[in-house]
C-alpha cells in the first residue's frame, strides 16, 4: 500500500507517456489521476514501466473501480493483465471477442496461467456457450483448451462450432470427453459426402459408439492403426473380422504389430482363432475351435 | 446353397414386442456369428444386435435393456427379443450370419410399430 502524498508542485500528470517511467512510486500515486489512467490505459503498454510501478498503477484502478474494471479498461490493460488476480478477474463483464484475443496475446506463449483460465471461464459462461469464434480464438492460443474442459463444460459446445476444432486439439482428450464431442462432430459433419465426411470425423472417433463403427466399415474408409487404437474397446469388441478387415483397409496388416495393446488385445480374446486366420496375419489369441463363452452373466457385463 | 430367412415382423402400437426369428440353412451354424440390422425408410442400413459364435452378445445404444439377441445352435436359429418398442423402431429387420471375411444377408421382415 502506498502513502497519500501529495504531488510535488509541476509534476502533476497531463497524459500517460514515457516521463512517467522516471517517478518514483510514491510520485505515481500522488501525481497520476485514476481517470486520466482509464482514459489512457492504450499508452501504458507502449511505456517500460517497472513492475513496482505497473502495481501502483494497478493500485489506482482498482480503487477508482472497486466492483471491477469496465471493459474499456480491460480491453487495453496489456501487461498490467499480468498482475491481475483471479479474484479481480471474477469481478469483471467480458464480452467482447477483441478484449479477449488482446489479454489473450499478452499471455501467448506461456501455459494456461490461472488469471487466464479465469478470464476464458467468464468469457464463455457470459456468453452462455462456447461459440464457434470464441472456439477458433480459444484453441489458436491454447490447442488443448478443448481438452481441459469437464464433459459437464463440452455439452455447452453447440455442434456449429466443432468446425473450428483441429486434430491437434483433441490429442490429450481423454474417452469421456470424445463421448461428448463425437456426436456433436456427426451431426456438424452429417451433411458431408463418405470421403470428405470420415477425413473430418476421424479425429473425433475415440468417442464412436459400435453402430457407427460398423456402418464406417461399408464406407471404405480406410483408418490408420493409430485412429483404430483410439478407438473405445467396448466398441471395437462387437466388431467382426470382417468389419474391422473393411475399416482399417490396406492398414489391416498393422493389427500384428498392436496384437498385445489395446484394443487389439482384447478384440483377438473374443475372436474364434480361425476367423482370425483368415486374416493371414499370424494373430494369435482367439478362442480356439470348438470352444464356446457359456458363462452370459459375465459377458453381459463385459459388453 | 446358404439361406437366411427372417419372420415374425408385424404391424404392432408403441409400447408392444415382437420376436423375430431367423432361421439358417446350408452353414454350420455354430461357428457362424448372428446380427441383426434394420433399414429404416430413406435410412442406411444399421445394426441392432449381434450374438457372437462364441457365445458374446452385444446391443447398440438404443436398443439396450429392450431387445435381446438369442440363439438356437440346434435349431440354426437366431431370435431377437423387441420388447418396448417404439414408432423409432420401425423398419425392416434383417439378420446376417458372419464367419471370417464370410457373409450372408437375409431378406428382412417388416416391422411397424404405430404411435
Known amino acids: 500500500e502506498v502513502e497519500k502524498t501529495a504531488c510535488p508542485s509541476g509534476k502533476k500528470a497531463r497524459e500517460i507517456d514515457e516521463s512517467l517511467i522516471f517517478y518514483k512510486k510514491w510520485e505515481l500515486e500522488a501525481c497520476v489521476d485514476a481517470a486520466l489512467l482509464a482514459t489512457q490505459m492504450d499508452r501504458v503498454n507502449a511505456i517500460p514501466f517497472t513492475y513496482e510501478q505497473l502495481d501502483v498503477l494497478k493500485h489506482k484502478l482498482d480503487e477508482l473501480y472497486p466492483q471491477g474494471y469496465p471493459e474499456s479498461v480491460i480491453q487495453h490493460l496489456g501487461y498490467l493483465f499480468l498482475k491481475m488476480s483471479p479474484e479481480d478477474i471474477r469481478k469483471w463483464n467480458v464480452t467482447s471477442l477483441e478484449t479477449l484475443k488482446a489479454l489473450l496475446e499478452v499471455n501467448k506463449g506461456h501455459e494456461m496461467s490461472p488469471q487466464v483460465a479465469t478470464l476464458i471461464d467468464r468469457f464463455v459462461k457470459g456468453r452462455g456457450q462456447l461459440d464457434k469464434d470464441t472456439l477458433d480464438t480459444l484453441t489458436a492460443f491454447y490447442p488443448g483448451y478443448l481438452c481441459s474442459l469437464s464433459p459437464e463444460e463440452l455439452s455447452s459446445v453447440p455442434p456449429s462450432s466443432i468446425w473450428a476444432v483441429r486434430p491437434q486439439d483433441l490429442d490429450t482428450c481423454d474417452p469421456r470427453q470424445l463421448d461428448v464431442l463425437y456426436p456433436k462432430a456427426r451431426l456438424a459433419f452429417q451433411n458431408m459426402n463418405g470421403s470428405e465426411y470420415f477425413v473430418k470425423i476421424q479425429s473425433f472417433l475415440g468417442g464412436a459408439p459400435t453402430e457407427d463403427l460398423k456402418a464406417l466399415s461399408q464406407q471404405n474408409v480406410s483408418m490408420d492403426l493409430a485412429t483404430f487404437m483410439k478407438l473405445r474397446t467396448d466398441a471395437v469388441l462387437p466388431l467382426t473380422v470382417a468389419e474391422v478387415q473393411k475399416l482399417l483397409g490396406p492398414h489391416v496388416e498393422g493389427l500384428k504389430a498392436e496384437e498385445r495393446h489395446r484394443p487389439v488385445r482384447d478384440w483377438i480374446l473374443r475372436q474364434r482363432q480361425d476367423d482370425l486366420d483368415t486374416l493371414g496375419l499370424g494373430l494369435q489369441g482367439g478362442i480356439p475351435n470348438g470352444y464356446l463363452v457359456l458363462d452370459l452373466s459375465m459377458q453381459e457385463a463385459l459388453s | 446353397q446358404v439361406q437366411l430367412v427372417e419372420s415374425g415382423g408385424g404391424l404392432v402400437q408403441t409400447g408392444g414386442s415382437l420376436r423375430l426369428s431367423c432361421a439358417a440353412s446350408?452353414?454350420?451354424?455354430?461357428?457362424?456369428?448372428m446380427e441383426w440390422f434394420r433399414q429404416a425408410p430413406g435410412k442406411q442400413r444399421e445394426w441392432v444386435a449381434s450374438h457372437t459364435s462364441t457365445g458374446y452378445v452385444y446391443y447398440r445404444d438404443s436398443v439396450k435393456g429392450r431387445f435381446t439377441i438369442s440363439r438356437d445352435n440346434a435349431k440354426s436359429t437366431v431370435y431377437l427379443q423387441m420388447n418396448s418398442l417404439k414408432p423409432e423402431d420401425t423398419a425392416i429387420y434383417y439378420c446376417?450370419?458372419?464367419?471370417?471375411?464370410?457373409?450372408?444377408w437375409g431378406q428382412g421382415t417388416q416391422v411397424t410399430v404405430s404411435s
Open positions: 446376417k450370419a458372419n464367419r471370417g471375411s464370410y457373409e450372408y
Open positions: 446350408g452353414l454350420t451354424f455354430g461357428v457362424y456369428g
